[in-house]
């Protein structure tokens, strides 16, 4: 699997999850989240050659098409597969609220 | 929705489904499919700016991050959303077989 265990410990050039830390204030301009100040969101990057963690029958076909037509703009793209939630604390007035923001952290990628 | 109805009738520059015809023999090197000779597979292409058909909370955050950091390599990508099957005819010996190949035709796209 193209997950953090594999990707963070390798020098994989193909589609893999990469490290990205997002600071809510500096990177997004968000003040409303009290805790945490930022988080390891990660992101997906890298080419999707034939048979590399392909998602569907279509992405297999498209990767093979791309193999035969390397100049074509049609190619699978490296996108998140498994996402995890992020617990946050924010305030409504003076009342702290705890919420899980769903689908916030990329754990693995796929070629779609 | 970024589907064939909208995308094929507009000059949309952002993420949208685009027309692509794949000839099984010429484009994939496949001889095993007897009918059809090829099909309209389509593909997804175009940038994914802030709020453009974003798939998850993560892709919204990443698009906003990208808006503030335009040089960053972390950005959502335009990929298939709705896929449809393709009925094919192939031969096993002299016996024709009809099969549905699932997830073969792109009907709509999303930013993931």
């Amino acid at each position: 699997a193209l997950d953090t265990n594999y990707c963070f410990s390798s020098t994989e050039k193909n589609c893999c999850v990469r490290q990205l830390y997002i600071d809510f204030r500096k990177d997004l301009g968000w003040k409303w989240i009290h805790e945490p100040k930022g988080y390891h969101a990660n992101f997906c990057l890298g080419p999707c050659p034939y048979i590399w963690s392909l998602d569907t029958q279509y992405s297999k076909v498209l990767a093979l098409y791309n193999q035969h037509n390397p100049g074509a703009s049609a190619a699978p793209c490296c996108v998140p597969q498994a996402l995890e939630p992020l617990p946050i604390v924010y305030y409504v007035g003076r009342k702290p609220k705890v919420e899980q923001l769903s689908n916030m952290i990329v754990r693995s990628c796929k070629c779609s | 929705a970024l589907d064939t109805n909208y995308c094929f009738s507009s000059t949309e520059k952002n993420c949208c489904v685009r027309q692509l015809y794949i000839d099984f023999r010429k484009d994939l090197g496949w001889k095993w499919i007897h009918e059809p000779k090829g099909y309209h597979a389509n593909f997804c292409l175009g940038p994914c700016p802030y709020i453009w058909s974003l798939d998850t909370q993560y892709s919204k955050v990443l698009a906003l991050y990208n808006q503030h950091n335009p040089g960053a390599s972390a950005a959502p990508c335009c990929v298939p959303q709705a896929l449809e099957p393709l009925p094919i005819v192939y031969y096993v010996g002299r016996k024709p077989k009809v099969e549905q190949l699932s997830n073969m035709i792109v009907r709509s796209c999303k930013c993931s």
């Epitope: 204030r25 997004l28 301009g29 968000w30 003040k31 409303w32 924010y90 409504v92 923001l101 | 709020i51 974003l54 909370q57 919204k60 906003l64 503030h68």
Partner: nanobody, 114 residues
Amino acid sequence: QLQLVESGGGLVQPGESLRLSCAASGIIFSASTMAWFRQAPGKQRELVALITDGDRTNYADSVKGRFTISRDNAENTVYLQMTELKFEDTAVYYCNAFWLKAYWGQGTQVTVSS
């Protein structure tokens, strides 16, 4: 029920100014990233300007130096001050709010014509 209501659109001549307003209700406005988008006939909807809850702003290249986005958290309103309007600014302008999910207003027409 969440509502975004735009106002301030109209017919102006090139070089003139307009101020659009978007009043929000039913969301935590002060936490929301607010944005203005526009859609000209036969064109895609495009981002014009956005302002985060931390007052960080971002503008489309075509409006930089002419348009200013601002917000009033006490009034739950976001504004778009448009100056030196051009023919190509003609479009329906939509207000957008993003907090946990995205919300849209119905739009207000801006026409620049001589």
